[in-house]
Structure formats: structure tokens, C-alpha cells
């Protein structure tokens, strides 16, 4: 059967019918419903929400909706023994204590089970000592302090501002520097946009607001106790000492009112330059320790959180494909939140809910997608992408054989300025073509396409007249699908103007103030940006599941491979003498990229010409497209990161949120001038060039004519 016979509606009409069915008012209603109480992973409230979503997805018309549960390691504060930080005098008396909770927002004063701010998976401990301010606690910040300024963090408690990089990387860096504790805080320079009021009068962070978050360094492992395998009923669990990615020193987050009290007393060295200064009225001295009059005072942390194996629940909905039921297009986003989840994740979950409803409506009218669509409401994303990773581990054999694409659906908004897309190069043309067909919601772009407003507001740095599309990094549920399994992935949301707003993320991220009202009053009163994101995410899923030929363009991969090869070569060429000494050549990589480019070009020509009415040939060509992303997977993984297996992309070793290209080569070159054994270090560079060149060549060959 052709696709049209199978679906009973012409393809063009299908997409329009699907998009027209999406309603802003429904997304608003769903968001409200999902945000009235906290839905912390592992709690009864989040289990009840899972069952509610299961029930509603069934009502919407999905073929089946199941709960998939796992018993994973989570972390909670001790209800009777709260976490806090003190300044103590020479007698050990606590002369200042940080707050134990965030002042609740108006209307939520009587809500129970609001988890106080904490750093998930912090070990217990009560370290005391001198404070060192380490800026953002990035790799380069510790290099500046320790290598350049000779300021030793060993045995110190470090205080770092949130922003720029994933908090887990900050903690890892602090541990490597020998710190015995970490205090994380939100500086107004990063979380308070000028000219905007703090919540509840605006979308800025108040002084008592605190960002929660996990501080793991899982590197894609999922549940820390069952790396590589699902945390099911018969799982073998590691001992806590062997668990993956747990921090070894106590960590705690605070707001800027409390940070002011710690930072205003800092002595020792001045900050190295103005980039280390935030917006508080303090000198931002680095330390170590407090200044003159306060030099006998110390900082003490009191951390009593516990790690507990707890049951979590994913909701997995299936809409069976009419023609290729064994080909899966997945739309997934998480359900668990730190508190109310007004933006993260429920602005995304509400969009998924409406997409499911629209697909269900079409199905009830007799339509089916060509391929199977799986919908997922993931649990425990906030605790390390645990729900999605455990499910993918459990279903890895199916996914690696049948997975066409994964579209992520966390927060729909982090601003209301323009679209933001991160995806595999295979999806560039899909995203371009789709956004050209959608209306822009932006003021001043009435009657114009989304593509036009997006391109104007966020232009590509390389190609004029095109929008910026970023590399996938991590920090969200696409990680296991893309970085481990090699399934083509993408994500889309509305974002802020990065040029004018330098704060990190959005100010109220992971705080108690991330409420329904935050979205409805300040970000998207008409829910028009949510609707646009629903159209982009839903439209991508529709096309991926329904187009006769998969909407992947392998030529776009060729273009970026050349760009990434040029970039990594230029990094290496900062060491021309060593490259000569150790005979380092990138010829094999450039040759492989050239071959890939030529083969991709020929494949694209064949894709235009082949007989689409021949189901065997159609399936063959589609399989070559589907398996191209898979071809970039190295079964051995990256050095010391076995679950990051994609050779072209991996989360940066210095910032989990950011994507790095040719990560194996990049990491081998990083800080190579400081390596004690240069011969060994440059040998590893050569090995990584070999792995990359082989992988690109091997991937190219999957696109060659099969015989």
C-alpha cells in the first residue's frame, strides 16, 4: 500500500489537520492542571500525575498507554534535620545562618511538600573552613586561580556563582581542586535582568530565591547504581561507593541575600579582573578567608541529605503506524519538577499533552501515521535523566534497530524573543521547511513566517539568510537516544534575546517561583509562543512519522563535518612544532570528510530518482537514512565516558549543557601543553584522529549503493 492508501487522507491535508487541531487555550489549561502542586520525582504526587496522564492519553485515542517503572537512586533533604550554612566565630558559635526555605509565592503559602533548596546527591557532611570565591567554577576559572594566581583551593570551602556551565561540572572542578565543600549561589548579574521586577511583580529572581538541581557527573550512565542496564526488579545494584558520578564533597545552593552575607566579608586576593565581579555590592574578593576584622571567622556547612533507592514511573503511549509499525518516532519530555514546574517541565509537558490530543483526534477520524509514534512522559529527569535513560536501556535493542528519530519536549519557553533549535544536521532541512510553513507569533512579524522572524532575530553565523541551529549537548532527555544510541534527535523552544540578556537560563529556573502565574502573567499570556513550539515539535514528529521518504538530508551532515574538521585542525595547529615532532596529520580525517561529501551527494541524487512505489527500495533508502546517525556511534565509547558513543558530538567535558564536535580529538588536545608526557599525549591525539577518520569513512560507506 502507498502511504496515502494507508492513512486515507492526503499528506498535505494530514499535516494541516494536525496543526489546526492544536489550540493555545488547551495548552494553557493543561499547564494550569500540571502546576498546582509539586511533582518531585519519587513522590506520591508525581505517581498520581503519571496515572492521570496515562488515563488522559488513553482518552485522547492512543492505542496503548503503559507505565514503565524503575527503582533508581534519588536524593532528598532530611525533613527533621535541615541543610544550611553558617558563619562561625572563633568559639564555634553560629553568628549567621542561611535561610532554610524560600519564602513561598503569593497563593502558595499553604502548599505542603515544597522541597527546600538543596543540591541533589550531595553527600552528608559538616565541613568548616575558609572560603574561596571561584567565579563560575569553570575549568578556566580554576586555571586562573590555581595556575596563574597560585591561590590554593585545597582544604577550602569554595563559593561559586551559578551560570555558564552545568552545576555538576562546577562541583567536579571543585573536587579536583581539593575543595572540601561547595556553596552555589545565584548572582543578580546572571539571574536578575535590568529593568524587570522580581517575582511576584516580574520574572526576576528575588533575593530569597534559590536554584535547586542535581550535581552528578553521570556522563550518560543513568541510574548511578545500574549503569548500562535497567533498574528493574532483578537488577544488580552497585554499592554506594561504586556508584557512578556521585559527588564526594558537600554542596548546597543559596540565594543572593545569603550570598551577600558570605561574600561581603571576603578578604585575601582581589578578583583577577572585572569578569569575576557580579552585581552584588561586595568586592568579590577571592580569599582565601575573610578580611582583617573577620579573619578568625569561618564558614561551616551542615548537610544531612540522604540518597534513597526510589520507584519512578514513565508514561509510554503508542500510536501504531499503518505502514511501518516497526519504525519509531519518539516525542518525549519529562514530568517531574523540583517544585511547581511552571516552565520546567510543565510548559513542555502541556505541549506534549496537546500534541497527543491532536494526534488522537486524527486517529479517531480514521487516520494513522505511516510509522509508529511513541509518546513519553519521563520521570526523574531532574535527578540525572534517569527515567528516559532506564527506559532506553531496557529497550535498547528495539531502539537501535527501529528508532527513526527522537524529539525532546522539556520547557517550551525560556524567553519569548525567538525560536531556538538544537538538532542533528539530518534535521536541518526539515526544520527549515517546517518553519517556512508556520506563522510567526512575534510582534512586528504579523503575516510573516516563523522562519523569517527566527532568521532575522537569530541569524546563522555561517550562512546568510538562514537561522542559527545549535549542536546538541546534554542536560536533557534526548541524551541517551542521541549520544548513546545514535538516534537522530532534535529539540525546539522559545528563547530570550541572548544579545541583550546575559543572565544564564531564565532567572526563576528551579526555584519555588516557577509557577503557572509566572508563565501566564509575564512570559506568554496568550500562550502563542507555546502554540508555536507545539507546532514545531508536533510538526517535526508528524513529518518524521508520515513522510514517505524520511525528511533527512545527509548533505547537511557533510557540510558540518567539514566545518568541524576545519575547527579541530585549527585548534591542533596552535601547536605546530609538536605536530611536526610527533607527525600528527589530519589528512585521513579530511579525506574521509571529502569521501562522505561525495557519497552523500550521490545518495541524494539517487534519493530524488528512485521508484518510490517500490516498497523494498523505499524501505532500503529510508533505512540508509535512519541508520546514518547510528553509523557515527563507536561501540567502545569515548575515553572514560563509555555511554557517550557518538564520535561527532558529545557533551563538553567542561559543560554538560554544551555540545562539542569531534569530542575525542578535542579532549585529547585540551590543555595538552600541560601534560607531563607529551609523546603519550600527542599519541592519543593521533589515535583520536584515526577513530574519527575511520568513523566518518564508515558512515559514508553506509550511504554507498548497497551492491
Amino acid at each position: 500500500k502507498s502511504s496515502n492508501e494507508a492513512t486515507n487522507i492526503t499528506p498535505k491535508h494530514n499535516m494541516k489537520a494536525f496543526l489546526d487541531e492544536l489550540k493555545a487555550e488547551n495548552i494553557k489549561k493543561f499547564l494550569y492542571n500540571f502546576t498546582q502542586i509539586p511533582h518531585l520525582a519519587g513522590t506520591e504526587q508525581n505517581f498520581q500525575l503519571a496515572k492521570q496522564i496515562q488515563s488522559q492519553w488513553k482518552e485522547f485515542g492512543l492505542d496503548s498507554v503503559e507505565l514503565a517503572h524503575y527503582d533508581v537512586l534519588l536524593s532528598y533533604p532530611n525533613k527533621t534535620h535541615p541543610n544550611y550554612i553558617s558563619i562561625i566565630n572563633e568559639d564555634g558559635n553560629e553568628i549567621f545562618n542561611t535561610s532554610l526555605f524560600e519564602p513561598p509565592p503569593p497563593g502558595y503559602e499553604n502548599v505542603s511538600d515544597i522541597v527546600p533548596p538543596f543540591s541533589a546527591f550531595s553527600p552528608q557532611g559538616m565541613p568548616e573552613g575558609d572560603l574561596v570565591y571561584v567565579n563560575y567554577a569553570r575549568t578556566e576559572d580554576f586555571f586562573k586561580l590555581e595556575r596563574d594566581m597560585k591561590i590554593n583551593c585545597s582544604g577550602k570551602i569554595v563559593i561559586a556563582r551559578y551560570g555558564k556551565v552545568f552545576r555538576g561540572n562546577k562541583v567536579k572542578n571543585a573536587q579536583l581542586a581539593g575543595a572540601k565543600g561547595v556553596i552555589l549561589y545565584s548572582d543578580p548579574a546572571d539571574y536578575f535582568a535590568p529593568g524587570v521586577k522580581s517575582y511576584p511583580d516580574g520574572w526576576n529572581l528575588p533575593g530569597g530565591g534559590v536554584q535547586r538541581g542535581n550535581i552528578l557527573n553521570l556522563n550518560g550512565a543513568g541510574d548511578p547504581l545500574t549503569p548500562g542496564y535497567p533498574a528493574n526488579e532483578y537488577a544488580y545494584r552497585r554499592g554506594i561507593a561504586e556508584a557512578v558520578g556521585l559527588p564526594s564533597i558537600p554542596v548546597h545552593p543559596i540565594g543572593y541575600y545569603d550570598a551577600q552575607k558570605l561574600l561581603e566579608k571576603m578578604g585575601g586576593s582581589a578578583p583577577p579582573d572585572s569578569s569575576w565581579r557580579g552585581s552584588l555590592k561586595v568586592p568579590y574578593n577571592v580569599g582565601p578567608g575573610f578580611t582583617g576584622n573577620f579573619s578568625t571567622q569561618k564558614v561551616k556547612m551542615h548537610i544531612h541529605s540522604t540518597n534513597e533507592v526510589t520507584r519512578i514511573y514513565n508514561v509510554i503511549g503508542t500510536l501504531r503506524g499503518a505502514v511501518e509499525p516497526d519504525r519509531y518516532v519518539i516525542l518525549g519530555g519529562h514530568r517531574d519538577s523540583w517544585v511547581f514546574g511552571g516552565i520546567d517541565p510543565q510548559s513542555g509537558a502541556a505541549v506534549v499533552h496537546e500534541i497527543v490530543r491532536s494526534f488522537g483526534t486524527l486517529k479517531k477520524e480514521g487516520w494513522r501515521p505511516r510509522r509508529t509514534i511513541l509518546f513519553a512522559s519521563w520521570d526523574a529527569e531532574e535527578f540525572g535523566l534517569l527515567g528516559s535513560t532506564e527506559w532506553a536501556e531496557e529497550n535498547s535493542r528495539l531502539l537501535q534497530e527501529r528508532g527513526v528519530a527522537y524529539i525532546n519536549a522539556d520547557s517550551s519557553i525560556e524567553g519569548n524573543y525567538t525560536l531556538r533549535v538544537d538538532c542533528t544536521p539530518l534535521m536541518y532541512s526539515l526544520v527549515h521547511n517546517l518553519t517556512k510553513e508556520l506563522k510567526s507569533p512575534d510582534e512586528g512579524f504579523e503575516g510573516k513566517s516563523l522562519y523569517e522572524s527566527w532568521t532575522k532575530k537569530s541569524p546563522s553565523p555561517e550562512f546568510s539568510g538562514m537561522p542559527r541551529i545549535s549542536k546538541l549537548g546534554s542536560g536533557n532527555d534526548f541524551e541517551v537516544f542521541f549520544q548513546r544510541l545514535g538516534i537522530a534527535s532534535g529539540r525546539a523552544r522559545y528563547t530570550k534575546n541572548w544579545e541583550t540578556n546575559k543572565f544564564s537560563g531564565y532567572p526563576l529556573y528551579h526555584s519555588v517561583y516557577e509557577t503557572y502565574e509566572l508563565v501566564e502573567k509575564f512570559y506568554d499570556p496568550m500562550f502563542k509562543y507555546h502554540l508555536t513550539v507545539a507546532q514545531v515539535r508536533g510538526g517535526m514528529v508528524f513529518e518524521l512519522a508520515n513522510s514517505i521518504v524520511l525528511p533527512f538530508d545527509c548533505r547537511d551532515y557533510a557540510v558540518v563535518l567539514r566545518k568541524y574538521a576545519d575547527k579541530i585542525y585549527s585548534i591542533s595547529m596552535k601547536h605546530p612544532q609538536e605536530m611536526k615532532t610527533y607527525s600528527v596529520s589530519f589528512d585521513s580525517l579530511f579525506s574521509a570528510v571529502k569521501n562522505f561529501t561525495e557519497i552523500a551527494s550521490k545518495f541524494s541524487e539517487r534519493l530524488q530518482d528512485f521508484d518510490k512505489s517500490n516498497p523494498i527500495v523505499l524501505r532500503m533508502m529510508n533505512d540508509q537514512l535512519m541508520f546514518l546517525e547510528r553509523a557515527f556511534i563507536d561501540p567502545l565509547g569515548l575515553p572514560d565516558r563509555p555511554f557517550y558513543r557518538h564520535v561527532i558530538y558529545a557533551p563538553s567535558s567542561h559543560n554538560k549543557y554544551a555540545g562539542e564536535s569531534f569530542p575525542g580529538i578535542y579532549d585529547a588536545l585540551f590543555d595538552i601543553e600541560s601534560k607531563v608526557d607529551p609523546s603519550k599525549a600527542w599519541g592519543e591525539v593521533k589515535r583520536q584522529i584515526y577513530v574519527a577518520a575511520f568513523t566518518v569513512q564508515a558512515a559514508a560507506e553506509t550511504l554507498s549503493e548497497v551492491a
Partner: antibody, heavy 119, light 108 residues
Framework: EVQLVQSGAEVKKPGESLKISCKGS????????IGWVRQMPGKGLEWMGI????????RYSPSFQGQVTISADKSISTAYLQWSSLKASDTAMYYC????????????WGQGTLVTVSS | GIVMTQSPATLSVSPGERATLSCRTS??????LAWYQQKPGQAPRLLIY???SRTTGIPARFSGSGSGTEFTLTISSLQSEDSAVYYC??????????FGQGTELEIK
């Protein structure tokens, strides 16, 4: 008591080389940056560069980069400032000073070494 | 680099009077400013650091204020031994630092 004691005054001819010294005592010499400051006759203070005696890491002011060499011998708690070829314009008082902290003011100063370069 | 401008170049004040010395920087340096006193034939002596913190042993009549780009050294009740050249210095852009051109304070 923290002390920085500098070597005595020098009179040199243009083109000659010179190495002046600054010996620290009363504190952990390897744990603090030592800086050199020039004061030309009747003029103000000019920062030349700093050294961390613990590992001899050295940083220069762009104005003095390539003109002078700063070094240290931690075994005898001494920092040095040297010229390979003096010029008449190098005539000045040279002070060594300890940095209170990595990025911080100079809290202790040597008594100064007067260098006179004249043909 | 950061340019330091001190004013006035010279200041003449009677004993017991207040002397106010100014230092302006070409860009914001937070509180990362020090004041030194240098008497003829002597090495400079640190008076104030962190814009307002007095070094141990410095009399209370010396006080510093300001932040960002505008800084002031105030000597509340001038004494004859306060006759000297006063320098401000920033230490905001590690490892760089620079001094102002100095203010000569003379006692009438």
C-alpha cells in the same frame, strides 16, 4: 617581622649588564608574589612585573617585557631584576615589594636600589 | 590598560585641616584600589587597600572611600608628618596594576 632587603646602589655604563637582588625574610617567601617597581628621578611609580618564587612563574608589564628579566632563587629567598644591556634611561630607583595577595596591593617594600647608568 | 588620574597634582593644607585627594580610573575597578604614602628618600608605604581598609598601624585620620571609578583619600586632621606624595594604585586586572601620577601634599 617581614623584611625585604635590597642590594646596594649601582653605577654602570651603557651596554653593561646588571643584576640587583631582594632578599625576603620573616614570612614564607615561596607563598607570596614579589613585584618590582621603577621610580625615575622626580617621577612616579611604575610597575614592572611580578614573580612567584614558589615556581618562578613571572609576569611582566607590557612596557617592560623584553627589557628586563625577573627571576628568583627560593633556596635563598631572593628575587632578582636584571638587564643584559643597560641604557641611560634605565637610571632610576628600583623597589621590590611583596604583594599582600595574588591580586592585591604591595604591603611590604624594600628600601630601594638606585641604579645610575652614565657614560 | 586602566588609566589612573589623580587630582590635584599638588595640595597645600594647614595643620589640623582636612585634606581630600582624588583618584579616578578609566574603567570600573570595583574596590580594587590602594593608597600609598611616599616621603622623600623613602620607599612607599601602604595606607589603604580595598578602597577603604586601613593597613595595620596606620592612624585613624587616614580614610579611604569610593568604588567603581571614583575614589577619595581623606586625611581628617593634617599633621606635619603627613607631608608626602600620595599615590593611588589599582590591582583590578591581574597580573597588571598601575599607579596614579601622584598628589604632592604640603603642609602650609
Amino acid at each position: 617581622e617581614v623584611q625585604l632587603v635590597q642590594s646596594g646602589a649601582e653605577v654602570k655604563k651603557p651596554g653593561e649588564s646588571l643584576k640587583i637582588s631582594c632578599k625576603g625574610s620573616g614570612y614564607s617567601f615561596t607563598s607570596y608574589w614579589i613585584g618590582w617597581v621603577r621610580q625615575m628621578p622626580g617621577k612616579g611609580l611604575e610597575w614592572m612585573g611580578i614573580i612567584y618564587p614558589g615556581d618562578s612563574d613571572t609576569r611582566y608589564s607590557p612596557s617592560f617585557q623584553g627589557q628586563v628579566t625577573i627571576s628568583a632563587d627560593k633556596s635563598i629567598s631572593t628575587a632578582y631584576l636584571q638587564w643584559s644591556s643597560l641604557k641611560a634611561s634605565d637610571t632610576a630607583m628600583y623597589y621590590c615589594a611583596r604583594r599582600m595577595a595574588a591580586a592585591g596591593p604591595f604591603d611590604y617594600w624594600g628600601q630601594g636600589t638606585l641604579v645610575t647608568v652614565s657614560s | 590598560g586602566i588609566v589612573m588620574t589623580q587630582s590635584p597634582a599638588t595640595l597645600s593644607v594647614s595643620p589640623g585641616e582636612r585634606a581630600t585627594l582624588s583618584c579616578r580610573t578609566s574603567q570600573s575597578i570595583g574596590w580594587n584600589l590602594a593608597w600609598y604614602q611616599q616621603k622623600p628618600g623613602q620607599a612607599p608605604r601602604l595606607l589603604i587597600y580595598g578602597a577603604s581598609s586601613r593597613t595595620t598601624g596606620i592612624p585613624a585620620r587616614f580614610s579611604g572611600s569610593g568604588s567603581g571609578t571614583e575614589f577619595t583619600l581623606t586625611i581628617s586632621s593634617l599633621q606635619s608628618e603627613d607631608s608626602a606624595v600620595y599615590y593611588c594604585q589599582h590591582y583590578d586586572n591581574w597580573p597588571m596594576c598601575s599607579f596614579g601620577q601622584g598628589t604632592e601634599l604640603e603642609i602650609k
